[in-house]
């Protein structure tokens, strides 16, 4: 297992609709054809794999399970979007990148993006 640098923004504020997007960039030492990206959430004394995708370079990301994530790739960058977030989902979201094929296997883990989620205020009742 070889180490690899992964960069991601320090802070992102989710939209009022609970959508947060950030870029995860990795310094690929070679020409990987198969890449796995995992988003981990570290908060509330827990570590959670929020979503994971494996993709062939140049292809769409295919996320596993009932994923709340979507994403696209461009070169050594992955554009990640997490939806359906609520205030209690605020936390540190860490990008983990694995170069699966061809060998050797590389692993990189970012420092994390602190995502802040603010639940929208309910609209006041109106007489109109």
């Amino acid at each position: 297992c070889k180490a690899m640098h992964v960069a991601q923004p320090a802070v992102v504020l989710a939209s009022s609709r609970g959508i947060a997007s950030f870029v995860c960039e990795y310094a690929s030492p070679g020409k990987a054809t198969e890449v796995r990206v995992t988003v981990l959430r570290q908060a509330d004394s827990q570590v959670t794999e929020v979503c994971a995708a494996t993709y062939m370079m140049g292809n769409e990301l295919t996320f596993l399970d009932d994923s709340i994530c979507t994403g696209t790739s461009s070169g050594n960058q992955v554009n990640l979007t997490i939806q359906g977030l609520r205030a209690m989902d605020t936390g540190l979201y860490i990008c983990k990148v694995e170069l699966m094929y061809p060998p050797p296997y590389y692993l990189g883990i970012g420092n994390g993006t602190q995502i802040y989620v603010i639940d929208p205020e309910p609209c006041p009742d109106s007489d109109f």
Epitope: D44, T48, V50, A52, L64, D65, D66, I68, M88, G91
Partner: nanobody
């Protein structure tokens, strides 16, 4: 409806390993998020680990991260908790639970509808 039966608990020494198993019945097992929780007498039930319906995604309490591994076999309707480097503070009754709903950034807060009867794990120093 899902019925859950845990097994594999026992008395071990600190530093040892143990594997808990949870056998499920019910046709819809593969659609549930499965979790392990633990509880000591007089204390609140505590989240240990959870695994998504396909088994692709997991979640762990910080206190067990790197020491415990949760896994599942949907064909056999089984969930496992591999516990290693056990500590005296891991002593508890361990419960298997099944939760409905999509995977989320905080699976510990999902609604777990079905629970097993628990299995005792005792770690002596």
């Amino acid at each position: 409806e899902v019925q859950l039966v845990e097994s594999g608990g026992g008395l071990v020494q600190a530093g040892d390993s143990l594997r808990l198993s949870c056998a499920a019945s019910g046709r819809t097992f593969s659609s549930y998020v499965m979790g392990w929780f633990r509880q000591a007498p007089g204390k609140e039930r505590e989240f240990v680990a959870a695994i998504s319906s396909s088994g692709a995604l997991t979640s762990y309490a910080d206190s067990v991260y790197g020491r415990f591994t949760i896994s599942r076999d949907n064909a056999k309707k089984m969930v496992y908790l591999q516990m290693s480097s056990l500590k005296p503070e891991d002593t508890d009754v361990y419960y298997c639970a099944a939760g409905r709903g999509p995977w989320s950034p905080r699976p510990s807060l999902l609604t777990y509808d079905y629970w097993g009867q628990g299995t005792q794990v005792t770690v002596s120093s």
